[in-house]
């Protein structure tokens, strides 16, 4: 009811001889704060009193001190909802009730906490899941209705005396609601955990033993088997007996169905632990295993091979790789069945048998032609010689061999022909199918393996072909040795190097490219003469009218060549030069008198020059000289001097009279 | 110390049942399986069966299996062996034991004898 | 079931012999957790309860004289008496206890 003081603590605490005890505690008061603190042990009420009697454990006074003697009790609350306690150490004889005599200002409270303290360390107790199956991960949990911060202790697990491997994780409880320490053990057990012996040991911070529980574990597993064969190796010739008998060795639960495998397959009408197999035979060869179930599930034992012995039956041959390719490995493989494996073996290539080949594979680095063929063998083991199967084919594939491309003309060839070529080779593996031609043109193939070649190239130089099947093989190029005229011809100026001056040594050189056949016969010619036979033209001082159109000729057997025609420039300083006059050299005064500079240059003038009768330069340049009006002191002689790139030239002198009009004779 | 102490002697009749008790003391009865294991007079031990009074779980040896039935009391730490069907050959005497981390202790043997 | 097959049946020795005595398990006993073989030796005598004294193969329980010793693993094991002692004259068992428990047939040892 609401005249209650509300308290949390635990309802009773757990501890033994020399430990301590922690009491967690929290309270409300009716109204205001703690006054008054008294803590009994084993508290009885006197109703003449009214107040209660026993033996005062711990006191709190006003002034809050506490007697010396109250150290081994503490309170460790406050005044208003801390009530927690400590006892260290905790004796036999706390063992009882404790009472909390609260105080307020008006109220009076008795709360009673129970505490159980035993002689020895106390056991913690082990929790099991209730079924534990193999390979499936339980949880082992050990709880000890003990925690105290003064005395700190550890939870050990051990397996059959051993510490456990697995980690295992502690953890504490020191609340209003519970005390204890907890340890909790996860482990993925395994059949052979069944029946063993796991104990949580309580230990002390020193790791001294203090107390333990222990608990057999019971591991549902499924049926772990032993399988034993007679005779021991299970090796057997067709027509003996064998006898396999299967031991079950743990099952949790009881075993309830045995069953019979071979190869994975369950053998009809065999549910005994003894498989007895009369007269094998060969095929009864193989992996057997007893299965035996109970409700967990089926357990398996490891498998006996069984070997019925037999002579090997015939054999076949197996090629990797057939078709071959020439240069490659080839492997060959003798499969024949038998038991025990065969330890010796015949081959024969072509049914003639191959010498020091008694291997079951017959290996050969390098495939050559006449490798192809049929291969056959025989094995052979302790209980006798096999039979020669029918044999495996072996085809060796290889390019075409001996390839070569064939000029079916008559020689020489000459520039513009036709010419046909064809492409031969020895054999081939497989059959050839297409040809190709080097070089590359548009060439017509009338038929299979032949190139025509219309109107031949002066350039054709080889022609190579390759005969193909999955390969190709190319014959060395042909040399068509086309014969023509001499190509390219062209006059080259040997020298001077540089322009030709009226004078200079010349030579014209006859170029040309190429010319098959290689001898040749030059011509020069100019203006259709003919001026040499050389391949130089050489001129020792060249004079301008040696300047025109030259052309050199070159020819051989197949024909002649003409270069185009070639211009020799001739550069000389003004020359010839005379000044001529229009209308005349006698003019009327009046009229008008032109002069002019005639000369022959190379390069053209450029420059002109007039002078008079005294020597006298006039300013006039231009290679005519205009006089207009003309007057009768213009009469006297004249003379002109031209200049070009090359030097300069002038003109003798040239009169020019000019005479008086009638007029000016009227005058006078 | 562990003690586990057997039943006086019984002669039975053949077809009749027998039950043997063990008492056990000096450690947590329900921390370790009970076996029970028989030796016929000249005869090897043989192994009967066991219970794990935690949970009762029992295994049995299946020459003995729907002839023997074992139990356990948790409030006396007794464990019993019955063995029903009796017959000549069931002769002999018969032992609790358990298994310790290292050791094994042995009740002191029950003389069952099966006689017309 | 794990089978135990010992050998011999039955000895005659004299005070002072060294006598050994084998056990086979028709599989392995030793169980790998722990490292341990799960094979104990057994002396009984006539009227009386079996006798630990050998336990893991080759651990001596606490009491028993050292003239006793255990060894092998796996599926073979053996029971070495040093000296025979006139006490020591009895049926001698091994017991695989890795999976229930399977006692071999028994060696008696007898005064020559």
């Known amino acids: 009811d609401s005249s209650k003081w509300v308290f949390e603590h635990p309802e009773t605490l757990y501890a033994w001889e020399g430990a301590c005890v922690w009491i967690p505690c929290t309270y409300r008061a009716l109204d205001g704060d703690l006054e008054s603190f008294i803590l009994f042990h084993n508290p009885e009420y006197n109703k003449n009193t009214s107040k209660f009697d026993g033996t005062r454990l711990y006191e709190s006074t006003k002034d809050g001190k506490v007697p010396s003697e109250q150290k081994r009790v503490q309170f460790l609350g406050d005044k208003n909802k801390n009530c927690t306690l400590s006892i260290h150490p905790v004796h036999l004889n706390d063992s009882g009730q404790l009472g909390l005599r609260m105080e307020s200002k008006t109220e009076k409270w008795m709360e009673r906490i129970h505490l159980n303290v035993s002689e020895r360390p106390f056991p913690p107790h082990i929790q099991l899941p209730p079924e534990i199956q193999e390979s499936q991960e339980v949880t082992l949990t050990c709880l000890l209705n003990f925690s105290c911060y003064g005395y700190p202790i550890q939870l050990q697990w051990l397996l059959e005396g051993v510490p456990m491997r697995q980690a295992a994780v502690t953890s504490t409880s020191l609340t209003i609601k519970s005390v204890f320490t907890r340890s909790e053990l996860k482990f993925s057990p395994q059949w052979s955990h069944h029946g063993k012996i796991v104990t949580c040991q309580l230990q002390d911070a020193d790791g001294k033993f203090l107390s333990n529980d222990t608990v057999q574990l019971n591991v549902k597993h499924t049926p772990k088997l032993e399988i034993k064969v007679t005779p021991s190796d299970a090796i057997v010739r067709e027509g003996d007996s064998v006898t396999m008998t299967c031991e079950v060795s743990s099952s949790n639960p009881e075993y309830t169905t045995v069953s019979w495998l071979k190869d994975g397959t369950s053998l009809k009408k065999q549910n005994t632990f003894t498989l007895n197999l009369r007269e094998v035979t060969k095929d009864q060869s193989g992996k057997y295993c007893c299965q035996v179930s109970n409700d967990v599930g089926p357990g398996r034992s490891e498998e006996v091979f069984l070997q019925v012995q037999y002579a090997p039956e015939p054999s076949t041959v197996q090629i990797l790789h057939s078709p071959a390719v020439e240069g490659s490995q080839v492997e060959f493989l003798c499969m024949s069945l038998a038991n025990p494996l065969p330890t010796n073996y015949t081959w024969y290539h072509n049914g003639k048998e191959m010498q020091g080949r008694t291997e079951e594979k017959v290996h050969i680095p390098k495939i050559l032609p006449w490798h192809a063929g049929t291969y056959s063998c025989v094995a052979e083991n302790i209980l006798g010689t096999g039979q020669r199967g029918p044999g495996a084919e072996l085809d060796v594939q290889y390019p075409p061999k001996k390839v070569t491309t064939v000029i079916q003309n008559p020689m020489p060839i000459r520039e513009g022909d036709t010419v046909t070529l064809s492409c031969n080779y020895n054999s081939s593996n497989p059959s050839v199918t297409r040809y190709e031609w080097k070089p590359h043109g548009a060439w017509e193939e009338p038929s299979l393996g032949v190139l025509k070649i219309q109107n031949v190239g002066w350039d054709n130089t080889t022609i190579a072909c390759a005969a193909c099947n999955s390969w190709c093989s190319w014959a060395s190029p042909v040399a068509l040795n086309v014969q023509y005229a001499p190509r390219d011809v062209r006059v080259r100026k040997i020298k001077p190097l540089s322009e030709i001056h009226s004078g200079n040594s010349v030579s014209l050189q006859c170029d040309f490219s190429s010319s098959h056949p290689k001898e040749v016969q030059f011509f020069w010619e100019k203006n259709g003469r003919l001026l040499g036979k050389e391949s130089q033209l050489n001129f020792d001082s060249i004079s301008p009218e040696d300047a025109g159109s030259y052309s050199c000729w070159v020819n051989n057997s197949i024909g002649q060549t003409a270069s185009k025609a070639w211009t020799l420039e001739v550069l000389y300083a003004p020359r010839r030069l005379r000044v001529s006059m229009s209308p005349g050299d006698q003019v009327m005064e009046g009229k008008s008198a032109t002069l002019t500079c005639e000369s022959d240059a190379n390069p053209p003038v450029s420059h002109y020059t007039w002078f008079d009768w005294n020597n006298q330069s006039l300013p006039y340049h231009s290679q005519k000289l205009r006089l207009e009006p003309v007057k009768v002191q213009h009469s006297g002689a004249y003379w002109c001097q031209g200049t070009n790139s090359v030097g300069k030239g002038r003109s003798p002198l040239s009169t020019l009279t000019v005479y008086y009009s009638p007029e000016t004779i009227g005058r006078r | 110390q562990v003690q586990l102490v057997q039943s006086g002697a019984e002669v039975k009749k053949p077809g009749a049942s027998v039950k043997v008790s063990c008492k056990a003391s000096?450690?947590?009865?329900?921390?370790?399986?009970l076996h029970w294991v028989r030796q016929a007079r000249g005869q090897r031990l043989e192994w009967i069966g066991y219970i794990n009074p935690r949970n009762d779980y029992t295994e049995y040896n299946r020459i003995f299996k729907g002839r023997v039935t074992i139990t356990a009391d948790k409030s006396t730490s007794t464990a019993y062996m019955e063995l029903s069907s009796l017959r000549s050959e069931d002769t002999a005497v018969y032992y609790c034991?358990?298994?310790?981390?290292?050791?094994?202790?042995w009740g002191q043997g029950t003389l069952v004898t099966v006689s017309s | 079931d794990i089978q135990m097959t010992q050998s011999p049946s039955s000895l005659s020795a004299s005070v002072g012999d060294r006598v050994t005595i084998t056990c086979k398990s028709s599989q392995s006993v030793l169980y790998s957790a722990v490292e341990k073989n799960y094979l104990a030796w057994y002396q009984q005598k006539p009227g009386q309860a079996p006798r630990l004294l050998i336990y893991w193969a080759s651990t001596r329980e606490r009491g028993i004289p050292d003239r006793f010793s255990g060894s092998g693993s796996g599926t073979d094991f053996t029971l070495t008496i040093s000296r025979l002692e006139p006490e020591d004259f009895a049926v001698y068992y091994c017991k695989q206890y890795l999976s229930s428990w399977t006692f071999g047939q028994g060696t008696k040892v007898e005064i020559k």
């Open positions: 034991a358990r298994r310790g981390i290292t050791t094994f202790y």
């Open positions: 000096g450690y947590v009865f329900t921390s370790y399986w």
